[in-house]
Each structure stands twice: as structure tokens, then as C-alpha cells.
């Protein structure tokens, strides 16, 4: 029996979550998460709860969604702690040093836990049909659940590298982790692609004292554009630079800047457009920067939050490991850069020490940035 439908997703706060379908006792599941460089996941509230729900809803696991599934999470009632019937978590608590969110903002209990003040009890997340979270359920720690949820925490993230002229992008990320939307990548993620003339290029997200950056990335795109324009990070021609309202929707490639007309790119310092387009009406005011499209400031630190409410602060069990991962790939022709996963399993390196293997994978898109790695 091999893990067959592992998925993971990340939030811009630097917290990442992975879902694993594997019949395991609680202790083995917790160790599996540690070996992957994380910890058994908390599912407190807000963004954290939404991220986990997205993983579940990304698709059913083994069995095709015909039965309810139970997933270990870091929720337990310790020995000598009593069941508290009026508390949202019923006397259970999350096993991490994170400050608690609003415990009222939590899932319901599928079944009320047994009243007790003596025995240690664990809890699972029950998912109806394997995809729709029903709520918490008390479970003896030595019994086997259908799977488990892990959490990882990064302090810094790399912004998605813009493809430019790159094709055949493939992504190798730590512990079966990848953002399908490519908004960011955690340290240890390797991106490889082909530039024009089938020249291979590979860059790796590395963390340093400043933040996170793409090692070996010269310029701001993977492969330089032959022309002057980029749209959504990919090379474009001027006729493709108009949005639905006739506004200029491109940015200028390296070495070019926005012309005075606000809708064409000129050689830096030239000041006048050298290509057509002066007759194109624009409903967008001219940009003041060298590109009409706001540039991502990077390296991205988690505390910048990328416009998203942060998840819990870095937890006691933070991520520092090197599991073996599947090879992620996408076709550059896809407008949204959706991922398609090759079926082999490759290894990669993250900030420090261990490697995990045995995942056959394909992806499915979900929000926020969930992916699927079920058998191809």
C-alpha cells in the first residue's frame, strides 16, 4: 500500500500544509510529518482552516470519495485534562506553541467526546466522502486513521520566477509541496525550464540573511524575451498587449522602458516609441515606473503577508528538512501556468537534512493553491 493521493498547499504567510492518505496510528503519523520536516498539523481557525479545507476539497482519496475518512491532526486531550462540554474544543488542545486563535471559530464535533479526566485522547478530522470536512471526532491514539495532515512553516518565500521565453517548466519542491498558482515557492524549490534553442536553465530558491531569492537567476525572468514585451510574465507581441478595454496590459522587458505614450516599450533612455501602437487608445493612465504592471518586490518575507491575513506564527516544529519529491511540470502555453505532474519521483534539497520518497503524482488545481499527487 503506497500513499496515493497526497496533496499540499501554501499560504502567503509561509505556512504550508500537506494531506496524506495512509492508514496509520497517531504516533506514526506524527513521526511521518516530522520526517517530512514539519509537524502534525494544527487546524485552528481562519486562514489555517481554509487552507486545510482546500486540500480536502481538491479531490477524494483512495476509494473515490465513497466513504468518510479520518485524518490525524495535532489535537489531543492530555492525561489529567478533563472533557469540557461547553468549550468549542471540548477540553482538547492544539499541540503547538502557537498562540491560540479564536477557538470558537472552529469546526463542530461530529460526535461529542466521552467524558473523562484520566485517559489521554486524540482527535481526528472527519471528512465526508473524503472531501467535505464534517468536524472533529475523538479517537483512541493507538487506532488507525485513514490519513494525516502535516504543517510546515517557512520564514521567507521566493516570488514565482517569471518565465519570459521559457518553456517546459518543471518544479521540484520540498516534501511534495507546490503552489499550483506559482505565486511563491518555499526555499529548496527548484525550477527548471528550456530557453530558446532548447537551452536548459535551472534555478533554486535559497534562503539567506536578507530573505529568499532564486539562485542563478540572472535578470528577472527565467529566459530573456526576444522582443520588448511581457504579459503575465511571459513574452508577448505588442498586438497582444491590449486588454479588453484597449488598455496596455504588458510590461517592458529588461533593457526597455515604457514610452511616453504609455503603451509601448522603448530602449531605455530613448524616450520615444520605436514600434507602432500610437493610435491605440488606452483607458489606463500612463505608468510612472518603467513598467505599467506593478513589479513584485522581493525577496518576499513572510511578514509582508502578500495581501493575505497571516496564519499562526512559526510553530515549535518548524520546517528544515529535505524530503524527496515528485517532479512537477507545467506547459508554458497554459495561460495560468497550471501544473501537470510527471509520474517519476526525484529528490531535491531544502534548507537541511532528510529526504522522503514514494509519491506517484498528478495535480489538480484548487484554492488556495492546492495540488494533487494521486496516481497518474
Amino acid at each position: 500500500e503506497h500513499p496515493t493521493a497526497d496533496r499540499a498547499g501554501c499560504s502567503a504567510s509561509g505556512a504550508c500544509y500537506s494531506l496524506h492518505h495512509a492508514t496509520m496510528k497517531r504516533q506514526a503519523a506524527e513521526e511521518a510529518c516530522i520526517l517530512r520536516g514539519g509537524a502534525l498539523s494544527t487546524v485552528r481557525a481562519g486562514a489555517e482552516l481554509r487552507a486545510v479545507l482546500a486540500l480536502l476539497r481538491a479531490g477524494p482519496g483512495p476509494g473515490g470519495g465513497s466513504k468518510d475518512l479520518l485524518f490525524w491532526v495535532a489535537l489531543e486531550r492530555r492525561r489529567s485534562h478533563c472533557t469540557l462540554e461547553n468549550e468549542p474544543l471540548r477540553g482538547f488542545s492544539w499541540l503547538s506553541s502557537d498562540p491560540g486563535g479564536l477557538e470558537s471559530d472552529t469546526l463542530q464535533w461530529v460526535e461529542e467526546p466521552q467524558r473523562s479526566c484520566t485517559a489521554r485522547r486524540c482527535a481526528v478530522l472527519q471528512a465526508t466522502g473524503g472531501v467535505e470536512p464534517a468536524g472533529w471526532k475523538e479517537m483512541r491514539c493507538h487506532l488507525r486513521a485513514n490519513g494525516y495532515l502535516c504543517k510546515y512553516q517557512f520564514e521567507v518565500l521566493c516570488p514565482a520566477p517569471r518565465p519570459g521565453a521559457a518553456s517546459n517548466l518543471s518544479y521540484r519542491a520540498p516534501f511534495q509541496l507546490h503552489s499550483a498558482a506559482l505565486d511563491f515557492s518555499p526555499p529548496g524549490t527548484e525550477v527548471s525550464a528550456l530557453c530558446r534553442g532548447q537551452l536548459p536553465i535551472s534555478v533554486t530558491c535559497i534562503a539567506d540573511e536578507i530573505g529568499a531569492r532564486w539562485d542563478k537567476l540572472s535578470g528577472d525572468v527565467l529566459c530573456p524575451c526576444p522582443g520588448r514585451y511581457l504579459r503575465a510574465g511571459k513574452c508577448a507581441e505588442l498586438p497582444n498587449c491590449l486588454d479588453d478595454l484597449g488598455g496596455f496590459a504588458c510590461e517592458c522587458a529588461t533593457g526597455f522602458e515604457l514610452g511616453k505614450d504609455g503603451r509601448s516599450c522603448v530602449t531605455s533612455g530613448e524616450g520615444q516609441p520605436t514600434l507602432g501602437g500610437t493610435g491605440v487608445p488606452t483607458r489606463r493612465p500612463p505608468a510612472t515606473a518603467t513598467s505599467p504592471v506593478p513589479q513584485r518586490t522581493w525577496p518576499i518575507r513572510v511578514d509582508e503577508k502578500l495581501g493575505e491575513t497571516p496564519l499562526v506564527p512559526e510553530q515549535d516544529n518548524s520546517v528544515t528538512s529535505i524530503p524527496e519529491i515528485p517532479r512537477w511540470g507545467s506547459q508554458s502555453t497554459m495561460s495560468t501556468l497550471q501544473m501537470s505532474l510527471q509520474a517519476e519521483s526525484k529528490a531535491t534539497i531544502t534548507p537541511s537534512g532528510s529526504v522522503i520518497s514514494k509519491f506517484n503524482s498528478t495535480t489538480s488545481s484548487a484554492t488556495p493553491q492546492a495540488f494533487d499527487s494521486s496516481s497518474a
Epitope: 500500500e1 503506497h2 500513499p3 495512509a22 492508514t23 496509520m24 496510528k25 504516533q27 506514526a28 506524527e30 513521526e31 511521518a32 516530522i34 520526517l35 517530512r36 520536516g37 506553541s97 488507525r144 515549535d316 516544529n317 518548524s318 520546517v319 528544515t320 528538512s321 537541511s352 537534512g353 532528510s354 529526504v355 522522503i356 520518497s357 514514494k358
Partner: antibody, heavy 117, light 108 residues
Framework: EVQLQQSGTVLARPGASVKMSCKAS????????MHWVKQRPGQGLEWIGA????????SYNQKFKGKAKLTAVTSTSTAYMELSSLTNEDSAVFYC????????????WGQGTSVTV | QIVLTQSPAIMSASLGERVTMTCTAS???????LHWYQQKPGSSPKLWIY???NLASGVPARFSGSGSGTSYSLTISSMEAEDAATYYC?????????FGGGTKLEIK
Amino acid sequence: EVQLQQSGTVLARPGASVKMSCKASGYTFTSYWMHWVKQRPGQGLEWIGAIYPGNSDTSYNQKFKGKAKLTAVTSTSTAYMELSSLTNEDSAVFYCTHYYGSDYAMDYWGQGTSVTV
Amino acid sequence: QIVLTQSPAIMSASLGERVTMTCTASSSVSSSYLHWYQQKPGSSPKLWIYSTSNLASGVPARFSGSGSGTSYSLTISSMEAEDAATYYCHQYHRSPRTFGGGTKLEIK
């Protein structure tokens, strides 16, 4: 009673490979991670990696990736570790070990397999 | 990876003496995942103290453990002859799990 019985002493030539075994008894083999630890003569302990026999999931210390390969045969409750491209640095005692309820401390150990290259 | 540094590397104590050895982690370790092992020559390591302060089965009550964050210690309240051994601290807070270099305790 939980027991981990390891295979005997091995003498090998540089460049060769060796495969050692660890037969488990007294517990459900497929329910717990099995770890391997290296100890060079007169030196400390190094974690090599672990395997979960229930689904053959493996995790390695990056230092031993490519050097050690962990496998398990559930029908015989036996874990194996193969070491390849042996050098003098691989001369050591190798232990199989697993936790059994003490917060991930390795509380059961085999007697060790001594490898001399 | 988390590096565990044990000190002293070698120490000797008289019978009945109080003994303390330390283990310092390069970054914070949850006390739940810090353990101590005892090893005698020719034998496998034995779990001695788990989760910082819990004595493993069969370990005499003269042993104790304490600490948090990056600093941990093992103490023997009154040294006995059978305590002569090498003691290793071990963390499993982060992968890869790592061991300290060991403290060899001898009888003076």
C-alpha cells in the same frame, strides 16, 4: 516482548555492497517506523534514515542519500539496509531501532551489525 | 540540521558524587523531543531519559533530566559504579534527527 534481531558481522571489499537485515518480533511491524543508526568505532551516533513498512515510505538523512537504501518485507517482518560503494568510512556498527511509545525516542534497538571494509 | 553539543566530552566522578552533564542545541528544541541514551562498551544504546525529564523503564531514580529551548542537562544525584558509561543526548524536534557527541562518564 519486542525484539530486533540483526544479521551478523560483515567483511567487505572497498567498492562492494552489503545488505544487512533486522527481523522484528513482538509488535506489529507495519505500524511503526524503523530507523537505522550508524556508529563508527569510538565515535558517536548518526541517524541514517527510516522506513515505514506499512507503505514503504522512506526518509533519509541527506548525508546517506545514495549510500544507504532501506527496504522492508512485511511478510517476514524484516527490514533491510543496503550500503553501496563501500569505503573505509563505512566501517561501523549499524543499528536498527524503533520507537514504541516514548515520544519518538528510539526505545528498542537491535544488537548491531558490524561492517568492516 | 540541529547540532547538539555535549560537555564535557569526558568526565570522572567519585562514587556518591553528584554529576551533571549538559547538552546544548544550535537552535531551539521542544522539550518533548529531547532524549538521553546510555551506552556501555560492546552494547547497544539504551533509552535512558525521554522527553527531557521522564525516566525510561528500569532507570534508577537518582537520574534526572531538565532543560528547555537550547539548554538541557542530565544529573546523577549520587554516582554509582554501574553509571559509568557514555551518555548521548538526542533530538527529534527537526529532521534529520541528531545526536550529541556524547559524554563519557568514568569512575574516579
